[in-house]
Amino acid sequence: VPPGEDSKDVAAPHRQPLTSSERIDKQIRYILDGISALRKETCNKSNMCESSKEALAENNLNLPKMAEKDGCFQSGFNEETCLVKIITGLLEFEVYLEYLQNRFESSEEQARAVQMSTKVLIQFLQKKAKNLDAITTPDPTTNASLLTKLQAQNQWLQDMTTHLILRSFKEFLQSSLRALRQM
């Protein structure tokens, strides 16, 4: 849970339900701040952030991405479809966030914070979407084999994968933030 959520920071009559727009927004921004710190370490450690060879690594990844059909963009916005996409996408990102856990030296705690905060965000959004049953949970066996495959890559591909996960997750959360403003 992001800092600043304790009782001294929020007036007693305004303790917000976990599904409140402000709470969800704060949670996403907290995760984005964490991603920003992780990206800084990744970019300082390798030249991945300037690399033009991203396509090579992207072939191995099936990172969640917002598309027009998901109803999260201004044109063709659909709040139910979009909310399902946001939750499904976050659930799909979890295996990639697990992969990130051993990828950082100085930001190890930050990587854990991003992972745990994402779990909390998913809970918030699932409460908000209590009437939606179209949310599919990724298959644990598939996730386990994907994780093994990612960890078996060579060093360059692992660095590139880390960079791509962080960049994609950032873009996904930014799109989610904009869409949730209309819900």
Partner: antibody
Framework: QVQLVESGGGLVQPGGSLRLSCAAS????????MYWVRQPPGKGLEWVSA????????YYGDSVKGRFTISRDNAKNTVYLQMNSLKPEDTALYYC????????????WGQGTQVTVSS | QTVVTQEPSLSVSPGGTVTLTCGLS?????????PGWFQQTPGQAPRALIY???DRHSGVPSRFSGSISGNKAALTITGAQPEDEADYYC?????????FGGGTHLTVLG
């Protein structure tokens, strides 16, 4: 050109009801959260209510909760405010307003519709 | 209930700079409160200047800028013009609702 036209205001007795409408044009109405804001005579702005783009979520200010109901018809590009159990303190100019999606987007308000609650 | 606080009145000389602030009676203003600023002149509907802390609406002069400074949102007018004399309201998203401040009346002297 974006337009928001409020209507349905008038003079009503305390305890009475009114239904305000806001007809929208010039933008993709179904992609926007919509709001009602009011301004009592000689006073400041007060946020009244909001409805999500698809109409699935509604939000109310404390002073109107349980008395006012916001709704929308995306096929008609219209947002409504059903006001029941009206009180003299509900007397105000009522504006409807669209939310914002993108950087540099214009913000539009209608000219408002006057609601007067008096016996 | 959390109250959104603003200075009741401020004044500025033409060409001068003035900063209006918007705070919470309890806690700090953050980006998640989506601070917005509105200008209203007598007999006119409000006009939005800034949304989401520092994004200027289309057609709003660049002399208007928004920020979060310390624990408050702020609207700065750099190079104030006589036509800037008006009431200015800030709005903050709190939980699931929006609250307006009581407004600041800005006088442009001279």
């Amino acid at each position: 050109q974006v337009q928001l036209v409020e209507s349905g205001g008038g003079l009503v007795q305390p305890g009475g009801s009114l239904r305000l409408s806001c007809a929208a044009s010039g933008f993709t109405f179904s992609s926007y959260r919509m709001y009602w804001v009011r301004q009592p005579p000689g006073k400041g702005l007060e946020w009244v209510s909001a409805i999500s783009a698809g109409g699935g979520s509604t939000y109310y200010g404390d002073s109107v909760k349980g008395r006012f109901t916001i709704s929308r018809d995306n096929a008609k590009n219209t947002v409504y405010l059903q006001m029941n159990s009206l009180k003299p303190e509900d007397t105000a100019l009522y504006y409807c307003k669209k939310s914002t999606w993108a950087d540099g987007e214009s913000d539009y308000w209608g000219q408002g519709t006057q609601v007067t609650v008096s016996s | 209930q959390t109250v959104v606080t603003q200075e009741p009145s401020l004044s500025v000389s033409p060409g001068g700079t003035v900063t209006l602030t918007c705070g919470l009676s309890s806690g700090s203003v953050t980006a998640s409160n989506y601070p917005g600023w509105f200008q209203q002149t007598p007999g006119q509907a409000p006009r939005a200047l800034i949304y989401s802390t520092n994004d200027r609406h289309s057609g709003v002069p660049s002399r208007f800028s928004g920020s979060i400074s310390g624990n408050k949102a702020a609207l700065t007018i750099t190079g104030a013009q006589p036509e800037d004399e008006a009431d200015y309201y800030c709005a903050l998203d709190i939980g699931d609702i929006t609250e307006f401040g009581g407004g600041t009346h800005l006088t442009v002297l001279g």
